[in-house]
């Protein structure tokens, strides 16, 4: 145990000219890497907006919160944070906005206390299926991660590999069943068109799921049944047209759930009747009085809660011989 007195070393900002002096020696307890700012009392290291191209090797052993935001890391290799001795205390790692386009298998290995990881605002064209699990075993050692923040990680269209982006992300989430303890998952702003049907069933500990600002059209094949701990489900700003009976029943069956559905292009025709009835009765939808129709044109901006069955009709589909030109 230590009994530190206040000293200048507890908060230091290393000068740029020391950048080449990175040592392979084990770091001193109060050493602060070049281009970083350290506070031992807050157990925090901030290497922010410094155009770093790799993770500093000489991170202090006390680091519990590591901010590596606004850099130019490009690739996160296997064992990017592996140190001898290991960074046993590191609990929160923020790599947002650091121009990462590749995260390799085992990038976060040897971080036994890592609870919160933020990779947001990186154009992840290549996210290894084993980025979070560390191995390609069918069942990996459980990851300590509790919060995984992956907002706006979709790469530009021309940088995407010839595979489904949704599939790539989901493969990383499900590999080796390593993320069984995950409680918060944020996947906002990723242009997701669909949610693979098996993803939620394998994340049974989820309490908070954010899928806002995507392009989800339907939840028909998505099951929420296993997510008995789910407390918040953010589906704002998607392309949802209607929620069908199966989805409504599953959401209603979750004991602690709050659902956010604002700014979706709801289609107010005969298929909407069940959802309107449910909305009028349910307490789980936050701000349900703000939900409005987008289509058909005659229903635009009508409030869903104010509709009745007579408002919700489907134009008859005429047989071809009776259709006019």
């Amino acid at each position: 145990s230590s009994s530190p007195t206040s000293s200048a070393s507890s908060f230091s900002s290393s000068a740029p000219f020391l950048a080449s002096a990175v040592s392979a020696q084990p770091p001193l307890p109060d050493q602060c890497p070049a281009l970083c700012e350290c506070s031992e009392a807050a157990r925090t290291v901030k290497c922010v907006n410094r155009n770093l191209t790799e993770v500093p090797t000489d991170l202090p052993a006390y680091v519990r919160n590591l901010f590596l935001t606004g850099n130019q890391l490009a690739v996160l290799p296997a064992g990017a944070f592996a140190r001898r001795p290991p960074l046993a205390e590191l609990a929160a790692l923020n790599l947002s906005g650091s121009r990462l386009d590749e995260v390799r298998a085992g990038a976060f290995e040897h971080l036994p206390s890592l609870r919160q990881l933020d990779l947001s605002h990186n154009p992840l064209a290549d996210l290894s299926p084993f980025a979070f699990s560390g191995s390609n075993a069918s069942v990996s050692a459980p990851s300590p991660l509790v919060e995984l923040i992956l907002n706006h990680i979709v790469p530009p269209e021309d940088e995407r590999q010839n595979r489904s982006f949704e599939g790539m992300v989901v493969a990383a989430l499900l590999a080796g069943r390593a993320l069984q303890g995950l409680r918060r998952l944020e996947l906002a702003s990723n242009h997701f068109l669909y949610l693979p049907r098996d993803v939620l069933a394998q994340l049974p500990s989820l309490r908070h799921l954010d899928l806002s600002n995507n392009s989800l059209v339907s939840l028909t094949y998505v099951s929420f049944r296993n997510l008995t701990h789910l407390e918040s489900l953010h589906l704002e700003d998607n392309a949802l047209k209607v929620l069908h009976n199966g989805t409504l029943a599953e959401l209603q069956g979750l004991p602690h759930i709050r659902v956010f559905l604002d700014n979706n292009p709801w289609v107010c025709d005969c298929h909407m009747a069940d959802m309107v009835t449910w909305l009028k009765e349910t307490e789980v939808v936050q701000g349900k009085d703000r939900l409005t129709c987008a289509y058909p044109e005659k229903m635009r901006n009508r409030v869903l809660l104010e509709l009745n069955s007579a408002d919700l009709d489907c134009d008859p589909i005429l047989p071809p011989s009776l259709q006019t030109s």
Epitope: S1, S2, P4, T5, S6, S7, S10, F11, E37, S39, E40, A41, A42, R43, T44, R64, N65, A88, E89, A91, A92, S113, R115, Q116, V146, E147
Partner: antibody, heavy 122, light 107 residues
Framework: GVQLQQSGPELVKPGASVKISCKAS????????MNWVKQSHGKSLEWIGD????????TYNQKFKDKATLTVDKSSSTAYMELRSLTSEDSAVYYC???????????????WGAGTTVTVSS | DIVMTQSPATLSVTPGDRVSLSCRAS??????LHWYQQKSHESPRLLIK???QSISGIPSRFSGSGSGSDFTLSINSVEPEDVGVYYC?????????FGAGTKLELK
Amino acid sequence: GVQLQQSGPELVKPGASVKISCKASGYTFTDFYMNWVKQSHGKSLEWIGDINPNNGVTTYNQKFKDKATLTVDKSSSTAYMELRSLTSEDSAVYYCATGAIHYGYDGYFDVWGAGTTVTVSS
Amino acid sequence: DIVMTQSPATLSVTPGDRVSLSCRASQSISDYLHWYQQKSHESPRLLIKYASQSISGIPSRFSGSGSGSDFTLSINSVEPEDVGVYYCQNGHSFPLTFGAGTKLELK
């Protein structure tokens, strides 16, 4: 919810020792440092030190390093502080406190126990 | 040790007033400054972390500003229940230290 339940008031004689407890619930005990803070009557707050429940590593305020000993029992999610060689100056309310609502972040306290009053008197 | 100096020691206010409490650190602590409210016979309660970050469940009338060594806690429209002692805390360097407090009372 997240709670820290402290042991009851103590009346002790000068020169004696006392061990007070703080039982955590509603979060993973080993995820967050446990801090101890002293508040003498009508006075401000003084940080005594903290302990990492995961490995028992402690950090003390120099002022209290010969006065307080911090320990934990992981099996019962309980933190302890022993105060020794007590004098009237040690009469105060002692709080345990942690940052248990927020992963990772340290150096501030968003969950506090109700406090344990220690009175040193002959 | 970093010394935290709060002013004024006491502030007498009328409900609806906008008030500012000052805290000065004896050396720069970046934004590692936290504010607490303590009502009579209660434990302290975190109001603001990292100089200006709001805390869930704390009324929006409480806000913080500052960086380096000068910090301010503002209450934009004081309510009667805001009476108590307000402490600032250095969360930057060991040992963690608190100011002596500003007592907020009603006129």
